[in-house]
Every structure is written in structure tokens, then in C-alpha cells.
């Protein structure tokens, strides 16, 4: 058993039929010695009396909020949560495996630039009795500070018969230099509690590997005289690291017909303009990627040819 | 993804072209190592990230763009021991910091060159003959060092009398290539920045 936070404890259980469970001794946080009674959750049934209560925790029915009282007053309480281990593996029932970029990916993270700010998100099909807490650091043996906000519900989607909920959190490395060469990864730890079930999820990455620029901005077309060609121009996204001559982007320009089956013309350039042939009913799209370190491409910015 | 090949203008900052070739070469070599050594810990997640230049050069600090010198997190250790001049500074008024920056890059390349050559000598003795260093990458390092043109004593290649441990050598190669790729990215950013300024 270990303390997750004040008055909240996690009991780690090997989960198999007829498992013996864990013996837990609860102590009432009070100078009082006599007339103390114990209850579980909001039930008034007295489980025991005295300053300590010994319980055998085997299943979820044994977890919950244990309260010690004296004469109608709450003296203290302890919330017991269960963390299941099945066949030596901690349970991952609360979050959905996103399977990208590989199996067992429960947390996904992205950064728009090298400022040390990043966003992580995760998916669940659970809608109620759900709480998350996020901690992060750079490195684990001598951790350096990363500050994360509260996790918030950021999207709801219908997937077949199920509703899927996306939660996200923003974190910021406390003293980040955009030009630094990372040698220690960022560690992100998410504690998840559903009803009385506790689980934890972790992710480890370098900011450079989770970079995904915002799409190029101010995408414009300028027709060239007496020609089917147009000059496409765009700008670096506002959120990208500066100076741009140091944090350079490379771009992919694509001409796409109305039908997805039509051949796509693609041009790669380091400049912020390109000359392409604009076909009728086609659209021109541009996306960006760090010029020197090949992490993710941005989403496309698009304009119609007409 | 291959980086777009830039053909330098005659007046272009001379080292940009070489640094782009360097990044391309080390990226290709790292990819080759990851494929060839697929049963060795050679991915970014599996290896320890060591920097052989740590405490010996300070390229990131010395080459910091002016705009980032206001960022206190970037100014941990802005002292370096190099002061000299090189041909990449051709016909440009350069600051003391820029000379420090380029000489720091030169020292990095020299250290990696020695390590890679020593390692290659060991790999050539491997009966499995599984992987060798790309001669093109070694040549590109040499070209960029010549373009930087700093006067520096030649460092003798390290020689070792004991029987090489080929497994350890291949792991060390992965560690070295990952670190050198990160440094090559920094060098490319610096050259791009200097070319624009």
C-alpha cells in the first residue's frame, strides 16, 4: 500500500481467482482513543471500533472510503483504491490503446516548436467517475522540472456504438532552451482513477521527436501572365520557433484534383514560394516539416485553384 | 527522406553546402546502422545518449543565435577557449563569438573523426564483417573541416592493443552516430543562420 496523495491510498493486488489479497491496517488520524467507529463509503453500517481497523483487501468491494467517526463527527478518512496486476502486468483498462506509432501507445504527445511546451492526449470510453493527474520531468534519476496543467476533456467522438472521450494536458519545461541538444528524455506520468480503480501510464520522448509544426499560414496564389502556372506563396506559422534562419522549415507543395484518384503533383522546397500548374477544380496544399530533423509533417494548408 | 540538394551560389556562405552534405551522410549512415544492427540496441529509445564533446567544446552555446541570447536557459555556460579564424568567414566581418562558434564546430568534427576512424579500424577486424563506416561520411567530415580551415594539430588515431569486443563496438557506433546526427543538425542550423545574417 502506498499514499497517492493526502488521505488517498493505493493497494496493489495480484489479480487471480482466490488470490489472498492484502492485509491493510487503517489508523484514525486523531488524538482520541475511545468511542471511535468505522464505516465504509456512505453506509452507516459499523465495520469496527477502536483507533485502528484491520481489513483484508481482495476485491473492489473492499476498496472505498473508510471513515472513522466519534459522536456524529468525522475524525479522519482514507480512500483505498486498487491497482490490479494480472500475470505480472499492471492493468490498462481505463485508457484505449491508440496503436500509433506502435501497439500499447496510450499517451500521445506533440510539440509545435522547440520552446519546451508540449501537449499530450489520451482516449477512453469511460464517461463518469474518472479523474486524471499528470506529472512530468526531464530525466528520471535527477529530474528537472516540467509543469503540467490539469487534464481536461478536449473532444467527444462517436465510434460505432461507443462514445470516445479525448482528454489532453499542456506541459511546459521550466527552463528550456530551444537550441539545446536533448540528451535526457521528457518523462510523462498520468495517474488515472476510475471509481476505485487506479492505473498509471507513462510516456518518454525527446521534444525533437514529437515536433509537428502548425500548417503554413497566409497561403496565396498569384496567376502568372499568359500561363496555366501560378506562384504559390506562404509564410512560416506564428507558433514556429525563431529565428527562422536557424529553425528552418522545408515544405511540400501538392496539387490535388477533385477526385482522390487523380494523380497528385508534389514539389519539395525550402523556399516560401513555388510555381505550379493549377488544374481546373484542383486545390493546392502546402505542409511544413523541420528542415534538418525529420519529425512529423504539419497538417496541410489548402486553397482552391479557381 | 533525402534532404533537398542545394546548389550553392558563388557568393554563398561556403560551409552551408558542406554541412548539408554532412547531415545527409550521417543520417544515411545511422539508417544503415539501424537496419544492419536490427538485433542490437540501436534505436533512439534503446541507447544511452552520450556526447563525446561534453565539457570539451560548447558548440550550442558558442553558436547561439543572437535572438536566443536573451533566453537565460540558453546561457548556462557561454565560455569557450577557442579564438581563431577560418575561411568560412570569407570576406565577412565576423564577431569574436562567430569565430568561437566555427572553431568549436571544427573541434567537434575533429573529435568525431578520430572516434569514427578508430572504430572503423576495429570493425574491419570483425570476422562477421557486418558493418563499416561509410567512406562518404568520413570524406564529408574531412571536407567540412577543410572548409573551416582552422589550424590545429593532427590528433593521432587511438590504437588499442587488447582484442576488440565487437558487440560493444557496434553499440558504441550506434551511440556515436545518434549523437553525431544531433550535432550535425545543430551545425546545419548554425550554417543556415550564418548564411542568412
Amino acid at each position: 500500500i502506498w499514499e497517492l496523495k493526502k488521505d488517498v491510498y493505493v493497494v496493489e493486488l495480484d489479480w487471480y481467482p482466490d488470490a489472498p489479497g492484502e492485509m491493510v491496517v487503517l489508523t484514525c488520524d486523531t488524538p482520541e482513543e475511545d468511542g471511535i467507529t468505522w464505516t465504509l463509503d456512505q453506509s452507516s453500517e459499523v465495520l469496527g471500533s477502536g483507533k485502528t481497523l484491520t481489513i483484508q483487501v481482495k476485491e473492489f468491494g473492499d476498496a472505498g472510503q473508510y471513515t472513522c467517526h466519534k459522536g456524529g463527527e468525522v475524525l479522519s478518512h482514507s480512500l483505498l483504491l486498487l491497482h490490479k496486476k494480472e500475470d505480472g502486468i499492471w492493468s490498462t483498462d481505463i485508457l484505449k490503446d491508440q496503436k500509433e506509432p506502435k501497439n500499447k501507445t496510450f499517451l500521445r504527445c506533440e510539440a509545435k516548436n522547440y520552446s519546451g511546451r508540449f501537449t499530450c492526449w489520451w482516449l477512453t470510453t469511460i464517461s463518469t467517475d474518472l479523474t486524471f493527474s499528470v506529472k512530468s520531468s526531464r530525466g528520471s534519476s535527477d529530474p528537472q522540472g516540467v509543469t503540467c496543467g490539469a487534464a481536461t476533456l478536449s473532444a467527444e467522438r462517436v465510434r460505432g456504438d461507443n462514445k470516445e472521450y479525448e482528454y489532453s494536458v499542456e506541459c511546459q519545461e521550466d527552463s528550456a532552451c530551444p537550441a539545446a541538444e536533448e540528451s535526457l528524455p521528457i518523462e510523462v506520468m498520468v495517474d488515472a482513477v476510475h471509481k476505485l480503480k487506479y492505473e498509471n501510464y507513462t510516456s518518454s520522448f525527446f521534444i525533437r521527436d514529437i515536433i509537428k509544426p502548425d500548417p503554413p499560414k497566409n497561403l496565396q496564389l498569384k496567376p502568372l501572365k499568359n500561363s496555366r502556372q501560378v506562384e504559390v506563396s506562404w509564410e512560416y506559422p506564428d507558433t514556429w520557433s525563431t529565428p527562422h534562419s536557424y529553425f528552418s522549415l522545408t515544405f511540400c507543395v501538392q496539387v490535388q484534383g477533385k477526385s482522390k484518384r487523380e494523380k497528385k503533383d508534389r514539389v519539395f522546397t525550402d523556399k516560401t514560394s513555388a510555381t505550379v500548374i493549377c488544374r481546373k477544380n484542383a486545390s493546392i496544399s502546402v505542409r511544413a516539416q523541420d528542415r534538418y530533423y525529420s519529425s512529423s509533417w504539419s497538417e496541410w494548408a489548402s486553397v482552391p485553384c479557381s | 527522406r533525402n534532404l533537398p540538394v542545394a546548389t550553392p551560389d558563388p557568393g554563398m556562405f561556403p560551409c552551408l553546402h558542406h554541412s548539408q552534405n554532412l547531415l545527409r551522410a550521417v543520417s544515411n549512415m545511422l539508417q544503415k546502422a539501424r537496419q544492419t544492427l536490427e538485433f542490437y540496441p540501436c534505436t533512439s529509445e534503446e541507447i544511452d545518449h552520450e556526447d563525446i564533446t561534453k565539457d570539451k567544446t560548447s558548440t550550442v552555446e558558442a553558436c547561439l543565435p543572437l535572438e536566443l541570447t536573451k533566453n537565460e536557459s540558453c546561457l548556462n555556460s557561454r565560455e569557450t577557449s577557442f579564438i581563431t579564424n577560418g575561411s568560412c568567414l570569407a570576406s565577412r566581418k565576423t564577431s569574436f563569438m562567430m569565430a568561437l562558434c566555427l572553431s568549436s564546430i571544427y573541434e567537434d568534427l575533429k573529435m568525431y573523426q578520430v572516434e569514427f576512424k578508430t572504430m572503423n579500424a576495429k570493425l574491419l577486424m570483425d570476422p562477421k564483417r557486418q558493418i563499416f563506416l561509410d567512406q562518404n561520411m568520413l570524406a564529408v567530415i574531412d571536407e567540412l573541416m577543410q572548409a573551416l580551415n582552422f589550424n590545429s594539430e593532427t590528433v593521432p588515431q587511438k590504437s588499442s592493443l587488447e582484442e576488440p569486443d565487437f558487440y560493444k563496438t557496434k553499440i558504441k557506433l550506434c551511440i556515436l552516430l545518434h549523437a553525431f546526427r544531433i550535432r550535425a543538425v545543430t551545425i546545419d542550423r548554425v550554417m543556415s543562420y550564418l548564411n542568412a545574417s
Epitope: 496523495k5 493526502k6 488521505d7 488517498v8 464505516t39 463509503d41 456512505q42 453506509s43 452507516s44 472505498g64 472510503q65 471513515t67 467517526h69 456524529g72 463527527e73 468525522v74 478518512h77 482514507s78 480512500l79 464517461s127 463518469t128 467517475d129 474518472l130 479523474t131 486524471f132 493527474s133 490539469a150 495517474d191 482513477v193 471509481k195 | -
Partner: nanobody, 114 residues
Framework: QVQLVESGGGLVQPGGSLRLSCAAS????????MSWYRQAPGKEHELVAG??????KYADSVKGRFTISRDNAKKTVYLQMNSLKPEDTAVYYC?????????WGQGTQVTVSS
Amino acid sequence: QVQLVESGGGLVQPGGSLRLSCAASGFTFSSYGMSWYRQAPGKEHELVAGISAGSTKYADSVKGRFTISRDNAKKTVYLQMNSLKPEDTAVYYCSRWPRLFEDWGQGTQVTVSS
């Protein structure tokens, strides 16, 4: 998602009364103890009152003046505040008790001033 929405705060003269309400959703309300915390400017959060398994707990500074109650059917917890003093001025938050991570509401401001 756990949601706690406080209301009922306002400006009141010393000696006056207010009743705060907290509407809860996103969790099984009847299974949890509930509490009211407050935070005065520049001070730590302090537990004002809690209700759990039918029993209550009060901070010494509010005993005899404040009363906590709950209505499980309405998923609401209340704080009746009488004989208010200037030192009761703070933002009042409701929370599950014991608190589970950051499940605060946005708070309701109570100002006691003549």
C-alpha cells in the same frame, strides 16, 4: 468528466448569512464524501467543512456558524453560512472528500464587508 459548479456567493455585511450550493456531475455522488474548502488571497486552501457517511467535520474557526448538508437525489452539497465575519472573505470551492486530484469547481467569491 468530473464537474463541480459552485454558486451562491456574493457581498454580505458582517453578521449576515449566505447559502452556497455545489452541483456535481460525472461521478457517483452518493458514494463520496463532499467538502467545502476556501482560499483567501495569498493563503493556502483550508478545509471549511466536510460531510461523509452522515457525519460532519468543521474547521474550528466556523464551528457553530456554518452547516454542511447534502441532497443525494439532486447531487448537490450545501454550505449554510451564518454570522459571517470579514475573515470569512475568500473564494469557496467544493470538492470530493478526500480530494481526488484536481477535482475543484471554479469557486464562488464570498466577500464580507461593511
